[in-house]
Interface confidence: low
């Protein structure tokens, strides 16, 4: 299963932020979108394999980090009105 | 079946260069993280270097860095160590391994350098 | 950057009997990763995340430990586990880091 948490956040502007996902199917690729009214979903970051990250189309202002297989949490680094959003985490093979 | 296979290792004098490579097979290769690991005459085993699956990100240990470069081909399913500056410490049987998360879920069979006036 | 310091460093075990090899770490950890390796092969991943066996290794082994000790069991000494052991971290930068290694021998 893949699951993602919190559920709901709600936060100051400025504070550091980090979404958490983790899947359980090994699988090597993860993604982070965002989505908005009037854009869908957004590609923010994603990650081919451990230790491998990459830049999406929304990248601004967030980072990931993969240090092993389940897990791709994802940081607003200062978190912004203009990141509020849903933000939705997935995995493939 | 999952083969990593090392090839390159050679007796190098002080200073000399060498590269190694691994062939890698059984596996969908752009989608891991690999590394070099050796194991000194005294049967230590060190990590040296390790390359991310799309090799935008590469990390060495301390004793290497300026000296080794990490490199790999996900075209030709392979990966490749560039070793200048060789001290005789560099000595070792050198293995290619594949990362199955903070640890090396399948290794080859080896090659070894030793570095020797 | 983390120190593992295995020991014993060589034992030596009857068939049948438990064996038991630690690996202490340096400063606190959350998992161990093992593996095995017999003469003149490379290593094999053997147990991974602290408890985990790979695939193919037999019910006897067990991993277990936390914080800054960890250890590898063998419920029944066979002779084909005569071999050497060897423990493993990873932290950030990243670095991995390999202890010195247990060698097993068969009574």
């Known amino acids: 299963e893949i699951t993602q948490s919190p559920r709901h956040k709600i936060t100051e502007t400025g504070r550091q932020v980090t979404l958490a996902c983790h899947q359980t199917w090994n699988h090597n690729n993860m993604f982070w979108y965002r989505q908005d009214l009037g854009h869908g979903l957004r590609l923010i970051h994603y990650s081919y394999g451990v230790h491998d990250t990459n830049k999406g189309e929304v990248s601004d202002g967030y980072s990931v980090s993969r240090s092993n297989t389940e897990d791709l949490p994802l940081t607003l680094e200062s978190a912004a009105s203009s990141q509020t959003s849903v933000y939705f985490c997935a995995s493939s093979e | 079946e999952v083969q990593l296979v090392e090839s390159g290792g050679d007796l190098v004098k002080p200073g000399g260069s060498l590269k190694l490579s691994c062939a890698v097979s059984?596996?969908?290769?752009?989608?891991?993280?690999m590394s070099w690991v050796r194991q000194t005459p005294d049967k230590r085993l060190e990590w040296v270097a390790l390359i991310s699956s799309g090799g935008s990100y590469t990390y060495y240990t301390d004793s290497v860095k300026g000296r080794f470069t990490i490199s790999r081909d996900n075209a030709k399913n392979t990966l490749y160590l560039q070793m200048s500056s060789l001290k005789s410490e560099d000595t070792a049987i050198y293995y290619c391994s594949r990362h199955g998360g903070n640890f090396f879920d399948y290794w080859g069979q080896g090659t070894t350098l030793t570095v020797s006036s | 950057q983390i120190v593992l310091t295995q020991s014993p460093s060589i034992m030596s075990a009857s068939p049948g009997e438990k064996v038991t090899m630690t690996c202490s770490v340096s400063s606190s950890v959350s998992y161990m990763h093992w593996y095995q390796q017999k003469s003149g092969t490379s290593p094999k991943r053997w147990i991974y995340d602290t408890s985990k066996l790979a695939s193919g290794v037999p019910a006897r082994f067990s991993g277990s430990g936390s914080g800054t000790s960890y250890s590898l069991t063998i419920s029944s000494m066979e002779a084909e586990d005569a071999a050497t052991y060897y423990c493993q971290q990873w932290s950030s930068n990243p670095q991995y880091t390999f202890g010195g290694g247990t060698k097993l021998e068969i009574k």
């Open positions: 059984g596996f969908t290769f752009r989608s891991y993280g």
